[in-house]
Structure formats: C-alpha cells, structure tokens
C-alpha cells in the first residue's frame, strides 16, 4: 500500500543490498510542504519493518539521527537472508484520530557473494545433439545473480550464453546450443562458470575436456532378435546405433530374474550372438553403446526388448507313480500318475504325453497320447508289466521313463520297518523309517506316498509322492499337506522286480475331534453286548484318530463311568464289551481321542442287557 | 453311504441294441469312478467298462466298439449303449462306484440289472 511517494522520499545507505551481519542507514525525508500541519514541530515520523507483509517491527527507537518536522534517520541492524520491506509513516501528533500517513518505502536485500561455481560438467547427447553443461553453484546467494557459461576451443571458436537464479528459479544449467562435431575428436575445449551479483564475483576453475569426454551416445533402438534355425538357445540380437559406435554393452535376463548377464561387444555394427539362452523363456533385452574403448561415457540402456525363446524339444525324465488294483478275478486296473516337468525341462508347452504299458513276455503294447498327468487301463492280471510315458512339445518328445508294475506290498521281506510320522509344523510330515531287515534283493529306492483320509476320486486325486535313495531313511512330506487332515503315509521299499511297504498315519496339526462317534445299534449276541456306531465325518476329526473310547454308567448313577479304549480302525464300526450286568438299565456314550485330546461325548443310547452276562 | 440304482435291462434280440442307466444317490461326492459289470449264469463277475472323472474310458475286449459308457454328472448318472447285442451279453449287469480314503478302495453296487440277448 505504497503511494508512489507523494508526500517524502527514503533512502538506504550504504545501499539497498548488503551482505549478511551489516547495518544500514534508512532516511525518510519529507517533501517541502508536506506534513501535518503549519507547525514542523508535530509531524512525527516513524519507521515500520515488514518481512513476507507482516508488520515485524516498529523502529521508533532506533533513530539516530532526526530533523524535527523534515527528517529521521533510523539504524537497522540483524536483518535476515532474503529481502526485508521498511515504510515510513507520517504520524501528525495533534490528531491522534487519524492514522499514520504512508510516505514511502525501500526494500532492503540481505544476501552474499557468489561461490566460485563447481564440479562442471558437460554432455552432448547424442552426434547430433547441442553441448549443455552444469554445475553446482554453491550456497544459495539469496539475491539476483547472473551466471554466464563460456566455452572456447579450437579456431578461435568461442561462445556463451546466460542464466540467472532469483527465489523463483534456479540457474545450475545451460545448453549452448552448438553441436560438436565428430570430426573435432582430438579437440581440447574449455567451459567457465562466472556468477555475479550484487554483492560480488566469482568465477570457476576453468574445465578442459574432448569430444569423447562428453559426447554420450544416443541409447541404441530398434532392438530385435533372431533365432537361428528356431533355436531356443541361440539368437543373434540386432540394433541400429549412431555411426561412430564402437562399443556396446549388452544386458539380458529372464523376467523373473534378480540378475543380468553382461556382454561386452566391441566393433559389433549391431549385431551380437547369443549362445546361453533357455529355450522357451521370456527374456528382457537392453543394450548400451560407447564411442570409444577406453574413454567416454556409455549411453543410457535402450529399451527393452521383451520376447521369449522358441521352445526345444523336452530334456528330463518324467517321475512316473502307479497304482493298482485287482477289477474282478482275471483283469487288473492299471492307473498311472506323472509329475509335470519344470520348465527348464519342458523346454516350452506340453503338448500330450506318449504313455505305453507292454507285457514283456508277450510282447502285448497298449500305446495312447493323453493331455492330463493321469492314465487308468484295465489290463490281464497275469504277466510282467512295464510302463512308459515321456512328454512332447513341438518340437519333439522327451526320453522315455520307464518303471516295472510290481505287487508294491506283495514282499513282506522288502517292507521298511520302524515308520514313524512326525509333525513338524503346519504344513509338513517328518517320516522316518527303518531299512527293510532280510530283504532277498537289494533297495533300489524309496518312495513315500500319502493320501487323505477322506474320501476323494482314485482318478481325480492323484497320489502324492517323493523319492528318496536307497541311502536315506527319512522325507519331509509338505505337498498339499494341511492341518487338521489325516494322512495315510506308505513307504515303499522298491528293488528291481518286488516291492514292499508299511503304512502309518500322520498329521501335521491337530485338534480333539468335533464330536464322538454316533451310536446306531446296540445288540446283545451270546451274553455280550455288540456297540455299533458311524464314524466321525472326516471333517470333524481333526486331525488322525488315535483311538475310540466307549463309556457306559447304570442309569441315575452318580458313580465314575467305566470305559474301553479301542484302537481307531476304519473299517471297524462294531465293538463287543461283555462286563454289564443283566437286567439293569445302563447308558452309553462314545468318544475320539486324537494326540490334542478327546472329543465331546457322541450320543447317549440306553440299554437293558437280558441275557446273563459274564 | 452311496445308493446305486441300474435300469433299462430286457430281452432283445441279437443284433439289438439297449442302453443302460444307473442314477447314483447319497454321499457321492466323491464318486467320480464309475464302472459296468456283468455276471453270466454260472460264471464269476467280469468287468465290462469304467469312465473315470475325466471321461476317460476303458472297455473290457470283448465289447469293446459295440459297448459305449458315458455318464451325466448333472444327474448322477452313467450310461452304457450296447448295440451289436450277442447272445454271450447275456447277464445280469451290475453298476459299480469305487472311491479311494488313504489307501483303501471303497466300493459300491447296484442290486442289477437282467439283459437277455435270445431270438
């Protein structure tokens, strides 16, 4: 709200910018003529500071120097960095309604000379590119200061260009706009930095450098790749690059890598082979190029070029599993189950698998391609069976696994012994066992098998295997392994032509059952007493079922109740007890017990045994 | 437990055709494994076909490319064509559903269906 000084003037000395920790001298005079009134002795005025439009300060104290009525001097001291707004007002001392009248205004600057610019540095991106260059300019001035970039070089070539850094810009940067040209290779040039404000000069060390030094490649484009032949191993990746190019720096990953390869190619004229790729893979491709070999700077990467490999026929052999089982009294049902390969053995998309079942003596061959990692056929009981499968893709088939189909618990000799099952947290089975005692043949390996205790498709819920060497006597089962679910494990002891297994039941987290067992049917046979039940429904088991627990109490009794403990059978759903006395009324109830403890009772059911009773 | 249910049997005459149904009830499901048996006078029971959850198919030797299985899982259901009909096809057919717990294979049956092939 300064009026263009109608009534007075200000000045500043030394002068309006100072250097931080000055003082400075501020003189408002009046204008001839100008005031409050006809008497000098009551104009009075004063002297306001301001910082970012807030009135800080009233400097009425800090006069040093004043002419009744015409003019004041004020002393200010400890002025901040930046700029700092005084007003001076008339304050007409009769009328002290009225407030003071504005007469002028200076605004102080507070700032300091100019470090000597640093760390210059200069690129020209590209042949065809401009030369542009920064630098650090130091501590920030706080006041208006010029920079100017200077370059000179061969031919008397000169050239300069300006910026300027206030408290709305910042000047560390310009861009000559001339072109360095390849031909000047050898050339030495050199760029200056000088800054000047108000309150000083400085200028950089001068910086010398070539064409070399500075001229950054445009990154490489129009990446593509070629398969030689379709390999997916062998590729010669190409690009376009700048003229003078004669180093690059190739990098490449699969996509879900963490690290790249690195290749350095010198006088490529892109194009690079590549001889380590993995068939049937998505890789990322980038490459940067150099002007020189031993000085400059490498562009920045290009873009990536995304493709996958083609596919090579598949390497590996499948893990084949089988189960069997007799259909009626002269046909077995043959169901074989495979492991899909990785993918660094699949070697791109299977396509079906080959499977083959043959009768060695006979030379019978049953031969099908299937699309699923199953194959059921029904085939004679009689003879000696082999089966193979192998996996093909488009570019061929793997080789073929092979495994003889023997009676896997037919050799009691070959069954492992002291099978153990251990859970070892929520989502695996330690296993352990002992090597079969007086086996006739030699192990030739293990297989660990498990299946849930619940029922499930024989074709839709394949098996769940592992092999283990003839050497190991322990596997840790975590494949759709889940708490609180039964399995039955089986450990095979296999050699060439027999097999024998134990089995065990294992969970990997367990609770006491949901509920007891259901009593259906209590029958009195012979004196004793037959308790059937329904089993638990699997999903309220919880875990492996150790054993069962039938309880019976004379009706109204207030005495503990007798019990029996049965071991858990699956197939068992009747029990005998034979302790009750005849003609009394007795209630019984059943429970499970798991290793975490022993369910509600089931249902009560009365009985009155009639008959004499042991 | 599982209920299994056949229909459709008769008396026809060689050359002939019939189809047979079995319609499965109860807990089934878990029962993807559906298979056809017969049993002629005097004779153990043979396996005749199976169809598994993927609708793959097996056919005892004998039947194999007159007899078809093939099932309806939105009505429980499995189906044998039989065209061709030889007077050896003569038996009683029964519908069978088998299902795996650990390792133990459960099995159910139908109580049978009569199919007389004479002229």
């Known amino acids: 709200n300064i009026d263009v000084c109608k009534l007075g003037t200000v000045t500043v000395q030394p002068a309006p910018v100072i250097p931080l920790g000055s003082a400075a001298n501020i003189s408002c005079s009046l204008n001839p003529k100008q005031g409050c009134s006809h008497y000098p002795s009551s104009n009075e005025l004063i002297l306001l500071k301001f910082v970012n439009d807030v009135l800080v300060e009233n400097l009425h104290g800090k006069k040093v120097h004043d002419h009744t009525g015409h003019s004041s001097t004020f002393q200010v001291t400890n002025l901040s960095l930046g700029m700092t707004l005084f007003v001076c007002k008339l304050n007409c001392s009769n009328s002290q309604k009225k407030p003071p009248v504005p007469v002028c205004g200076v605004e102080i600057s507070v700032g300091v000379a100019p470090e000597p610019p640093q760390n210059i540095s200069c690129v020209q991106e590209g042949e065809n590119g401009t030369v542009a260059c920064s630098w650090n300019s130091g501590k920030v001035t706080y006041l208006k200061t010029n920079y100017t970039l200077q370059l000179s070089g061969p031919n008397n070539l000169t050239c300069q260009k300006q910026c300027f850094s206030d408290n709305r810009q910042n000047c560390n940067r310009l861009d000559l706009g001339i072109n360095l040209s390849p031909d000047l290779a050898e050339s030495r040039f050199i760029v200056r930095v000088t800054a000047i404000n108000d309150l000083g000069n400085s200028s950089s060390l001068p910086h010398t450098f070539t064409f070399l030094d500075i001229v950054i490649p445009l990154p490489p484009w129009d990446i593509r790749i070629n398969f030689l032949n379709a390999s997916g191993s062998r590729g010669t990746l190409q690009w376009e690059d700048e003229g003078q190019v004669v180093l690059n720096q190739l990098r490449y990953q699969p996509l879900n890598s963490t690290s790249w390869n690195m290749v350095n190619a010198t006088n490529a004229k892109g194009k690079y082979d590549l001889r380590d790729l993995r068939p049937f893979t998505e890789y990322e491709f980038q490459i940067s190029s150099k002007l020189h070999l031993s000085g400059g700077s490498w562009s920045n990467w290009s873009e990536s070029l995304r493709t996958r490999t083609p596919e090579e026929e598949p390497v590996g052999i499948l893990d084949i599993w089988y189960m069997k089982q007799d259909i009626d009294y002269d046909r077995q049902q043959i169901s074989l189950f495979w492991k899909s390969l990785n993918p660094s053995e699949a070697r791109g998309k299977i396509l079906h698998y080959q499977v083959t079942l043959q009768e060695v003596t006979k030379k019978t061959t049953l031969q099908n391609t299937t699309r699923h990692t199953s194959w059921t056929r029904v085939i004679p009981r009689t003879g000696a069976w082999t089966a193979s499968v192998s996996a093909a893709n488009s570019k061929g088939a793997s080789a073929p696994t092979h495994i003889n189909i023997v009676d896997l618990c037919g050799t009691g000799l070959l069954a492992p012994h002291q099978v153990s099952a251990k859970s070892e947290n929520m989502d695996n089975i330690l296993v352990t066992w002992q090597p079969p005692k007086k086996a006739d043949s030699a192990v030739r390996e293990y297989i660990v098998e498990w299946r849930a205790l619940q029922p499930g498709s024989i074709t839709k819920f394949p098996p769940h295997w592992l092999r283990i060497p003839p050497d190991n006597m322990s596997a840790l089962i975590s494949e759709n392994i889940k708490p609180y679910i039964c399995y039955e494990i089986r450990v095979h002891a296999l050699s060439e032509s027999q097999g024998g297994c134990s089995s065990i039941r294992g969970d990997s987290k367990h609770k006491a059952p949901v509920s007891g067992p259901h009593i259906t049917a209590i029958t009195e046979k012979k004196e004793r007493l037959f308790i059937s039940w329904t089993h638990i429904p699997f999903p309220e088991q919880r875990g492996c079922i150790l054993h069962y627990r039938i309880y019976w109490k004379e009706r109204d009794s207030t005495a503990q109740p007798e019990l029996c403990e049965i071991q858990y059978r699956r197939s068992q759903n009747s029990h005998p007890i034979s302790s009750l006395q005849p003609r009394v009324t007795y209630v019984l109830w059943m429970t499970a017990v798991t290793a975490a403890g022993e369910s509600p009772q089931g249902n009560e059911r009365e009985f009155c045994p009639q008959g004499k009773a042991n | 437990q599982v209920q299994l249910q056949e229909s459709g049997g008769g008396l026809v005459q060689p050359g002939g055709s019939l189809t047979l149904s079995c319609t499965a009830s109860g807990s089934i499901f878990a029962i993807d494994d559906m298979y056809w048996y017969r049993q002629a006078p005097g004779k153990q029971r043979e396996f005749v076909a199976y169809?598994?959850?993927?609708?793959?198919?097996n056919y005892l030797d004998s039947v194999n490319g007159r007899f078809t299985i093939s099932r309806d899982n939105a009505k429980n259901s499995v189906y044998l064509q039989m065209n061709s009909l030889k007077p050896e096809d003569t038996a009683v057919y029964y519908c069978n559903a088998k299902q795996i717990v650990g390792f133990q294979i459960d099995e159910y049956w139908g109580q049978g269906t009569q199919v007389t092939v004479s002229s």
């Open positions: 169809i598994t959850a993927t609708n793959s198919a």
